[in-house]
Amino acid sequence: ALDAAYCFRNVQDNCCLRPLYIDFKRDLGWKWIHEPKGYNANFCAGACPYLWSSDTQHSRVLSLYNTINPEASASPCCVSQDLEPLTILYYIGKTPKIEQLSNMIVKSCKCS
Amino acid sequence: ALDAAYCFRNVQDNCCLRPLYIDFKRDLGWKWIHEPKGYNANFCAGACPYLWSSDTQHSRVLSLYNTINPEASASPCCVSQDLEPLTILYYIGKTPKIEQLSNMIVKSCKCS
């Protein structure tokens, strides 16, 4: 799996999980989240060469198509596979509220 | 939706469905499929600017992060959303066999 266990341990130019810390105030301009101040969002990036972690029949076909037709621009792309939620604390007036924001943290990647 | 109805009618540099016909023999080197000789596989390509058809909270966050940090390389990517199967006819020796290959045709795209 193209997850932290594999990607953060290996120098990998191909599609892999990349570390990315997002500071809510500085990076998003969000002042409304009280805690945490930021989080490890991570992101997916890297080349999708011949059948590298292709996730569907179509992406495998496209990968093979690109190998045989190297001038083609129709190549798979490195995107998130497994995502996890992030629990945040914010205030509605003086009232604290805990919320779980779905699909905020990327845990693994794929070529799609 | 970034599907044929929208994308094939508009000239669109941003993430959209692109037409792609794949000839099994010529483009994949496959001689084993008898019918069809090829099919409209389509593919997804184009830029994913701020909030252009972002499909998850993470991709929306990443999109906003990129707007505020334009030097960052952590941008969403244009990939397939809805896929459809393709029915093929092939032969096992002299015996014809019909098979449905899943996720072979891209019908719409998203920024992920």
């Epitope: 059948l51 029949q57 495998r60 076909v61 093979l64 190998t67 045989i68 | 994949l28 080197g29 496959w30 001689k31 084993w32 092939y90 032969y91 096992i92 020796g93 002299k94 015996t95 098979e99 290959l101």
Partner: antibody
């Protein structure tokens, strides 16, 4: 130049398991159906099964059905034969082969073979 | 399954002679679902003929195949020393693929 190189053959006890590998080079691996063929010592050839590229449709000889599994890692240009519940009669040289193009077809390239011995 | 019977079991000939090997199927294969292979001791089989009569790339033209239905023939027009080996026919008209038991071609 097309090359198929098998590995993984060994001496194994009855009911044991073994995985054979076949690394292909010199052509676009995912364009051809691949098969395994075996040959018992001093005997003739016996087809084991095939796998179709990308879509991973596989079919097996009755003698190995339910015990053997053919798979492929297209990114690594590698074909596998997972053999479980091995029997004495599975003792043979196992060849990895490339078919000409159809699902059932003549086999234009063969590996050098790897010997599997099942004995207690 | 389709049974292939090769004859003769052993063929003893001298270099320069003509060799005729037979392969009979238990049911009709049509005209193009038969292949011939050559195997030398300690080596993998080598494809000679496919589609009953098409020569594989790099195979000398002294090798030829013919036949359809249930009866097929491999002919070696003029035997060379390197031709002495075991020859197998293979059918791929029906699953499972089957092979003949082989014909051993030996030097007389």
């Amino acid at each position: 130049e097309v090359q198929l190189v098998e590995s993984g053959g060994d001496l194994v006890k009855p009911a044991g398991s073994l995985r054979l590998s076949c690394v292909a080079s010199g052509y676009t691996f995912s364009s051809n159906v691949m098969s395994w063929v075996r040959q018992a010592p001093g005997k003739g050839l016996q087809w084991v099964g095939y796998v179709i590229p990308i879509v991973d449709i596989a079919n097996y000889a009755d003698a190995v059905k339910g015990r053997f599994t053919i798979s492929r890692d297209n990114a690594k240009n590698t074909l596998y034969l997972q053999m479980n519940s091995l029997r004495v009669e599975d003792t043979a040289v196992y060849y990895c082969t490339r078919t000409l193009g159809l699902v059932l077809d003549a086999m234009d390239y063969w590996g050098q073979g790897t010997l599997v011995t099942v004995s207690s | 399954e389709t049974v292939l019977t090769q004859s003769p079991g052993t063929l003893s000939l001298s270099p320069g002679e003509r060799a005729t090997l037979s392969c009979r199927a238990s049911q009709s294969l049509g005209s193009s679902y038969l292949a011939w292979y050559q195997q030398k001791p300690g080596q993998a089989p080598r494809l000679l003929i496919y589609g009953a009569s098409s020569r594989a790339p790099g195979i000398p033209d002294r090798f030829s195949g013919s036949g359809s239905g249930t009866d097929f023939t491999l002919t070696i027009s003029r035997l060379e020393p390197e031709d002495f080996a075991v020859y197998y026919c293979q059918q791929y008209a029906d699953s499972p693929i089957t092979f003949g038991q082989g014909t051993r071609l030996e030097i007389k």
